[in-house]
Every structure is written in structure tokens, then in C-alpha cells.
């Protein structure tokens, strides 16, 4: 008796699903009866299939209403975890184990990744200095690094501070400042660059015309 | 090749506690596995005492030794730890830490002895 | 709580015998359960786990069976190093446990 399992890694964006397989032998008809699956995630229960159906009292909370195992699927002999609107703490190493007759378990891993897509900017000017000052914060996971260009494509270095958000969710709260002597209509751009994976996403920051919010002059560096 | 090595063995008072220690190499303790405490008595058998979890060290113990065990583990070390209390004569034995794999213990240390007496 | 029981307790055989040792569950249970052997003065090595398949490394005359409540472990032909006492022992997810049977040694003849 031996579980396939068709990927042992699975890599997924915060918020989306995840379909994780194993599979098992089947001849004929399944009987459910004689089938348990335990789907479990190190200390947590994810699912329980025995006597013919999913018992809901073992599974941890954090996956309440969010983990299935679609019968449809079990009777052709595929045990699949389905996980709605995956959280980062979901990531992890996950070990399907059935018991049909004979018995296996494998181990998959799970990796959750929060791409920091949507950038918020503001820019602001010390009219004392003519300075200004550009802001680049996203959230996402797993940490970024935030490289500043101008229009030349040449580096500037700004300042990222990176703390946790205080959500339920973890993110990353990464916010990125750079100060430069510019003038209106000058084109910046920050980009948020995850470093393992080498995803990155951009921003562009265009110095308006206008006056601009005006920032307090007891600005500490 | 994965190698465990407990340390923290020898002669306590009844009454007292234990904290061993169960040194890894060739595998982080961080990483995909778990990590039991088994004891043995001295001509007697296997006892699982608990296990804990790689990332978010969560722990599961066995009903007769809930609330006076502790498994913990120093990521940094590679190390596991179990701490029992108010020990008894009976607690006397064979102390081994193993890896787990999905449904048993895959890799043993070579054990340490415990004995409880005044 | 499940218990399991192994028999014999005890056993003598020769080198070459086939050896079976059985384990009992109190009550029906998902074959996650694997057998250990231990010999003296050492640490259990896993041998058989999920009732049949053949830990990495171990040889090929020890095999596993069973379902249910009755699970077996055979040695095809006893060898010299097979002297040793074994144990069977059983996984349950919630509560989360594991439990072990109480051991067979197997004796020279």
C-alpha cells in the first residue's frame, strides 16, 4: 500500500486556495468504512476522515470552516486538502496518512508568500530646504528590501524601516523613505524586491508642480 | 546522518526534577520533523512521554505525565530538552529522545539513565 | 484508551526459524502502527512502520501484515543478530499519542 503524492511542495499566495493531493490505491469500489485519512499540520488537526465521514470535533480552530476533503475525490482514491483563503500561518509541513487496508503517510510542504502589490506613496517638501520627501509602504510577506531610482535608472538610498503589522494576519509593514533634492515633474521610483524569491513590484513617484504638504520642521532624522 | 545525543542523566532525590538534554546533528530541529521523548524502565517497556513540533513548537504529552513535563527546544543549540517534576521512584529508567517521522520514531539517541533515590 | 498486546512474551527459536509475533489492539484500529527492535543495553530501531512497509535499511526477511486488530510481524529466517526484544506500537492522531506494546523477546534455542 503505497500514497503518491504529486507534489511535495506547494507555493501559494496569501488569500487564495490550495488543492494539496495524495493518492492511494483503489480497486473496484471504495468502501468508505474501511478508510481513515488524517491530514494534520505538526500539532494541528486539519482533517479527520473515519467511519465514512469527516469528524469536525479534532480539527483546530484556525482552520474551522476554511479546510476540506471532497468525497468525490476520496472515491477515486485522490485524499485532497482544500484550504480556502490561506493564511501565512498556514505555512508549514502538512502529512496526509491513510489507512486502507494497509497503510502510508507523506509529508508536503507548504509556503505562503504576500506579494507586496499594492504600494502607498506620499510625497511631501520642507519648503526651508527645498527637500523632499518620498514614501513608499506596502505590506506583504516574506521581507522586502526597497531599492529607489530615478529616471536615469541610477540607485539612491532611502531609508526602509520594517515592522510587523499589528493585523491578525502577520504581514510585513515595510515602509521605505527617501529625501532628495528634486524638481517638479522628476520621476522616482521605488521598487519592493523580495530577495529569495526575485519577485519585485514598482511604484513611480512623479514630483507635482503644485505646492505639496509641507513637512514640520522639527523633524527628527 | 542523523545523530542524537542525550546528556543530563544520574541520581535524583524523590521529589525533585530533571532537565535533560538531547543534542542534534546532521538535521535541524527546525526543519519538517518532530521530536518525541520515550523513557524505558529498568527491564520493562517503551513509554512514549511527549513530543514537540519543529516551527511552531507546539507540544502534545502523554495523559500520565501532563502537568509535570515540559519539552522545549533551543533552535540556536539544535537541542531538545525535557524537564520532569516531582519525580518518584518509578520514574526511574532509560531516558531516549528520537525523531519522528509521520507515524513513529525513525532515529534514537543512545539513551540516558535517570534514577530516582534518596 | 487503546492498549496493545503482544504475543508471545516471550519466545525461543533457532537460526534459520521462521518467528511471528503477533499484536493485538482492544479495538479496531487504522493500520498506523509500526515494530521496533531493541537489544540490550541499545536504542529501539524502527523496522517495520504503517503495518507493512519496510523501513529504509532493514532487511528483507522481516515483513509486516495485518489490519484491524491483528497485526504481525514475521522474520522469515532468523539470523544470529535477530536476538532481541521487539515491540509493536500504534499512532493515533487526536488525541495525539502513541502507544506501545509491552514487548517480545526472542531467545536462542
Known amino acids: 500500500f503505497t500514497i503518491t503524492a504529486p507534489k511535495d511542495l506547494y507555493v501559494v499566495e496569501y488569500g487564495s486556495n490550495v488543492t494539496m493531493e495524495c493518492r492511494f490505491p483503489v480497486e473496484q469500489k471504495l468502501d468508505l468504512l474501511a478508510l481513515v485519512v488524517y491530514w494534520e499540520k505538526e500539532d494541528k488537526e486539519v482533517i479527520q476522515f473515519v467511519e465514512g465521514e469527516e469528524d469536525l470535533k479534532p480539527q483546530h480552530s484556525s482552520f474551522r470552516g476554511r479546510a476540506f476533503l471532497p468525497k468525490d475525490q476520496l472515491l477515486k482514491g485522490n485524499a485532497v486538502l482544500q484550504i480556502t483563503d490561506v493564511k501565512l500561518q498556514d505555512a508549514g509541513v502538512y502529512c496526509c496518512m491513510i489507512s486502507y487496508g494497509g497503510a502510508d503517510y507523506k509529508r508536503i510542504t507548504l509556503k505562503v508568500n504576500a506579494p507586496y502589490r499594492k504600494i502607498n506613496q506620499r510625497i511631501s517638501m520642507d519648503p526651508a530646504t527645498s527637500e523632499h520627501e518620498l514614501m513608499c509602504q506596502a505590506e506583504g510577506y516574506p521581507e522586502a528590501e526597497v531599492i529607489w531610482t530615478n529616471s536615469d535608472h541610477q540607485s539612491l538610498s532611502g531609508e526602509t524601516t520594517v515592522t510587523t503589522s499589528q493585523t491578525e494576519e502577520k504581514l510585513l509593514n515595510v515602509t521605505s523613505v527617501l529625501r532628495v533634492n528634486a524638481t517638479a515633474n522628476d520621476v522616482f521610483h521605488c521598487t519592493f524586491w523580495r530577495v529569495h524569491s526575485g519577485e519585485n513590484h514598482t511604484a513611480e513617484l512623479i514630483i507635482p508642480e503644485l505646492p505639496v504638504p509641507r513637512l514640520p520642521h522639527n523633524r527628527t532624522h | 546522518e542523523v545523530q542524537l545525543v542525550e546528556s543530563g542523566g544520574g541520581l535524583v532525590q524523590p521529589g525533585g526534577s530533571l532537565r535533560l538534554s538531547c543534542a542534534a546533528s546532521?538535521?535541524?530541529?527546525?526543519?519538517?520533523?518532530?521530536w518525541g521523548w520515550i523513557r524505558q524502565a529498568p527491564g520493562k517497556g517503551l513509554e512514549w512521554i511527549g513530543i514537540?513540533?519543529?516551527?511552531?513548537?507546539?507540544?502534545n504529552y502523554a495523559q500520565k505525565f501532563q502537568g509535570r513535563v515540559t519539552i522545549s527546544r533551543d533552535n540556536s543549540k539544535n537541542t531538545l530538552y525535557l524537564q520532569l517534576n516531582s519525580l518518584r521512584a518509578e520514574d526511574t529508567a532509560v531516558y531516549y529522545c528520537?525523531?519522528?517521522?509521520?507515524?513513529?520514531?525513525?532515529?534514537w539517541g543512545q539513551g540516558t539513565l535517570v534514577t530516582v533515590s534518596s | 484508551d487503546i492498549q496493545l498486546t503482544q504475543s508471545p512474551s516471550s519466545l525461543s527459536a533457532s537460526v534459520g526459524d521462521r518467528v511471528t509475533i503477533t499484536c493485538r489492539a482492544s479495538?479496531?484500529?487504522?493500520?498506523?502502527l509500526n515494530w521496533y527492535q531493541q537489544k540490550p543495553g541499545k536504542a529501539p530501531k524502527l523496522l517495520i512502520y504503517?503495518?507493512?512497509s519496510l523501513q529504509s535499511g532493514v532487511p528483507s526477511r522481516f515483513s509486516g501484515s495485518g489490519s484491524g486488530t491483528d497485526f504481525t510481524l514475521t522474520i522469515s529466517s532468523l539470523q544470529p543478530e535477530d536476538f532481541a526484544t521487539y515491540y509493536c506500537?500504534?499512532?493515533?492522531?487526536?488525541?495525539?499519542?502513541?502507544?506501545f506494546g509491552q514487548g517480545t523477546k526472542v531467545e536462542i534455542k
Open positions: 514537540i513540533y519543529p516551527s511552531g513548537g507546539g507540544t
Open positions: 506500537q500504534h499512532y493515533i492522531s487526536w488525541p495525539r499519542q502513541f502507544t
Open positions: 504503517a503495518a507493512s
Open positions: 546532521g538535521y535541524s530541529i527546525s526543519s519538517g520533523y518532530y
Open positions: 528520537a525523531r519522528g517521522g509521520g507515524l513513529g520514531f525513525d532515529y
Open positions: 479495538q479496531s484500529i487504522p493500520s498506523f
